[in-house]
Interface confidence: low
């Protein structure tokens, strides 16, 4: 058993039929010595008396809020949550496996630049009685600070018969050094509690590996005289790290016909303009990637040819 | 070339060669994004590589103030990786083809380090740890880790030279 936060405890249980469970001793937080009784949740049934209460925790029915009282007055509470271990593996019932980029990916994270700010998100089909707590650090043995904001519901989607909820959190490295080569990964830890079930999820990454720039901005076309060619120009996204002479992007320019089956023409360039042939009913798209490190491409910015 | 007394390197040449290094490092180990090498253990094997750290003056402001600190750090790293790529880890079994990207990478690391340091002038170089895994599969894993680490190193070096070429070239 360990303390998650004040008066909230997590009992780690091997979960199999007829498992013996875990013996837990609860102590009433009071100078009082006698006349103390214990109850569980909203029930008025007295579970025991005395300053300590010994219970055998085997299942969710044994978890909940234990309260000690004296003469009708509440003295203290202890909330017991269960963390299940099945076949040596901690349960992952609360969050959905996103399977990208690999199986058992519960947390996904992205950064728009090298400022040390990043966003992580996760999915669940649970809509109520759900809380998350997010902590992060750079490195684990001698951790350096990363401050995470609040995990908030960022999207709701219908997937077949199920509703899926996406939660996200923004974190910022306290003393980020955008120009340095990272040697220690960022660690993200998410505590999830659904009713009386506790689970934890972790992710470890370098900012450089989760970089995904925003799409190029101000995408414009300028027709060239007496030609089917156009000059496409664009700018670095506002959210990208500066100066751009240091934090450079490379770009992919694509001409795509109306039909998905039509051949795509692609040009790669480090410049912020390119000359392409604009076909009728086609569209021109541009996306960006870090010039020197192959992290994710941005989403496309598009403009019609006409 | 960076010469004693702190004159400027050939920023544009360094920029071109460092960008080529980035391309080669990724072609030598392109699937790196889909492999979480930290899960494989052997943390210590790549912990000894030189990293370009916050105080090394490789940020835009540090380069403007005095680029020599940063260039020295980059030079150390280039020599280190050049030695690693020429070591038993890469030359032993399973053997690489003579014209593999790793061979080109090795040559380019040497080329850039020579651009930064002409004959007769020596910055101190970091000792290369003795990494001689006995099993071929361990060697393979170690190659991946070294290339992964090299990709991050040359990305920072390329940013430095691109910025230098754009803002510090005479």
């Amino acid at each position: 058993i360990w303390e998650l936060k004040k008066d909230v405890y997590v009992v780690e249980l091997d979960w199999y039929p007829d498992a013996p469970g875990e013996m837990v001793v609860l102590t009433c937080d009071t100078p009082e010595e006698d006349g103390i009784t214990w109850t569980l949740d909203q029930s008025s049934e007295v579970l025991g008396s005395g300053k300590t209460l010994t219970i055998q925790v085997k299942e969710f029915g044994d978890a909940g809020q234990y309260t000690c009282h004296k003469g009708g007055e509440v003295l203290s509470h202890s909330l017991l949550l269960l963390h299940k271990k099945e076949d040596g593996i901690w349960s992952t019932d609360i969050l959905k496996d996103q399977k990208e980029p690999k199986n058992k990916t519960f947390l996904r994270c992205e950064a728009k630049n090298y400022s040390g700010r990043f966003t992580c998100w996760w999915l669940t089909t649970i809509s109520t009685d759900l809380t998350f707590s997010v902590k992060s650090s750079r490195g684990s043995s001698d951790p350096q600070g990363v401050t995470c904001g609040a995990a908030t519901l960022s999207a709701e989607r219908v997937r077949g018969d199920n509703k899926e909820y996406e939660y996200s959190v923004e974190c910022q490295e306290d003393s980020a050094c955008p120009a340095a080569e990272e040697s220690l990964p960022i660690e993200v830890m998410v505590d999830a509690v659904h009713k009386l079930k506790y689970e934890n999820y972790t992710s470890s990454f370098f900012i450089r590996d989760i970089i995904k720039p925003d799409p190029p901005k101000n995408l414009q076309l300028k027709p060239l005289k007496n030609s089917r060619q156009v000059e496409v120009s664009w700018e670095y996204p506002d959210t990208w790290s500066t100066p751009h002479s240091y934090f450079s992007l490379t770009f992919c320019v694509q001409v795509q016909g109306k039909s998905k089956r039509e051949k795509k023409d692609r040009v790669f360039t480090d410049k912020t303009s390119a000359t392409v042939i604009c076909r009728k009913n086609a569209s021109i798209s541009v996306r960006a990637q870090d010039r020197y490190y192959s992290s994710s491409w941005s989403e496309w910015a598009s403009v019609p040819c006409s | 070339r960076a010469v004693p007394g702190g004159s400027s390197p050939a920023w544009t040449q360094c920029q071109q060669l460092s960008q080529k290094l980035c391309t080669l490092a990724w072609s030598a180990h392109p699937l790196v994004g889909h492999m979480d090498l930290r899960e494989e253990g052997d943390e210590e094997t790549t912990n000894d590589v030189p990293h370009i750290q916050c105080g090394d003056g490789c940020d835009p402001q540090g380069l403007r103030d005095n680029s020599q600190f940063c260039l020295q750090r980059i030079h150390q790293g280039l020599i280190f990786y050049e030695k690693l790529l020429g070591s038993d880890i890469f030359t032993g079994e399973p053997s690489l083809l003579p014209d593999s990207p790793v061979a080109q990478l090795h040559a380019s690391l040497l080329g850039l380090s020579q651009l930064l340091q002409p004959e007769g002038h020596h910055w101190e170089t970091q000792q290369i740890p003795s990494l001689s895994p006995s099993q071929p599969w361990q060697r393979l894993l170690l190659r991946f880790k070294i290339l992964r680490s090299l990709q991050a190193f040359v990305a920072v070096a390329a940013r430095v030279f691109a910025h230098g070429a754009a803002t510090l070239s005479p």
């Epitope: 707590s133 995470c148 609040a150 908030t152 519901l153 709701e156 909820y165 959190v169 | -």
Partner: antibody, heavy 127, light 108 residues
């Protein structure tokens, strides 16, 4: 687009109670807290308390403890604020405001800003 | 309770001028818990800035927030006619959540 729509103006006698409603239209209640904030004529804003519509747990400012009751009906996406033992100084515009549900180094807590407000309900207490 | 003191109480400026509004807390407030609101007569408040420095959706770039600990600032770089209103800072660090008494920005 989500909107918070409040009930109409009320005139009440001192000592009586008033119950103001706040309905979320075009969205879900579940990911939000609903706070109640009041503003006396020509005065500043004063937070009264809030409710988590899913868990039903309400927090009240000490000043209003015992006089205010905040409730919510998730099925109709409506929150209610009832203020009892009214006095003339309770004359104010009462606003409901949404704050997204969040976590911060602890558990669910309404630490987010009030990003959506109702139009306000004027409650006049006069004999 | 955390007391937020805003200054000045009234700011008389002309369109195009820069407005600097101050909010001082009686005890330290994490910047993640500080917000600024704009209120016009007869209207509900509108969120401008949260996390001390982040602009809310649809808020023009002329509005910016800064500060940490006990001292926070809202800056309007160049006043537009529609910016003349009352501005409130708010902390959600501790319950009860509290607002400053407001700064009225009026046309000179």
């Amino acid at each position: 687009q989500v909107q918070l729509v409040q009930s109409g103006a009320e005139v009440k006698k001192p000592g009586s109670s008033v119950k103001v409603s706040c309905k979320a239209s075009g969205g879900t209640f579940s990911s939000n807290y609903i706070s109640w904030v009041r503003q006396a004529p020509g005065q500043g804003l004063e937070w009264m308390g809030l409710i988590d519509p899913v868990f039903g747990g309400a927090y009240y400012a000490q000043k209003f403890q015992g006089r205010v009751t905040i409730t919510a009906d998730e099925s109709t996406s409506t929150a209610y604020m009832e203020l009892s033992s009214l006095r003339s100084e309770d004359t104010a515009v009462y606003y409901c405001a949404r704050s997204k549900k969040g976590m911060y180094g602890g558990w669910t807590y309404p630490l987010m800003m009030f990003d959506l407000w109702g139009q306000g309900t004027l409650v006049t207490v006069s004999s | 309770d955390i007391v937020l003191t805003q200054s000045p109480a009234t700011l008389s400026l002309s369109p195009g001028e820069r407005a600097t509004l101050s909010c001082r807390a009686s005890q330290s407030v994490s910047s993640n818990y500080l917000a600024w609101y704009q209120q016009k007569p007869g209207q509900a408040p509108r969120l401008l800035i949260y996390y001390a420095s982040r602009r809310a959706t649809g808020v023009p770039a002329r509005f910016s927030g800064s500060g940490s600990g006990t001292d926070f600032t809202l800056t309007i770089s160049s006043l537009e006619p529609e910016d003349f209103a009352t501005y409130y800072c708010q902390q959600t660090s501790n319950t009860p959540f509290t607002f400053g008494q407001g700064t009225k920005v009026e046309i000179k």
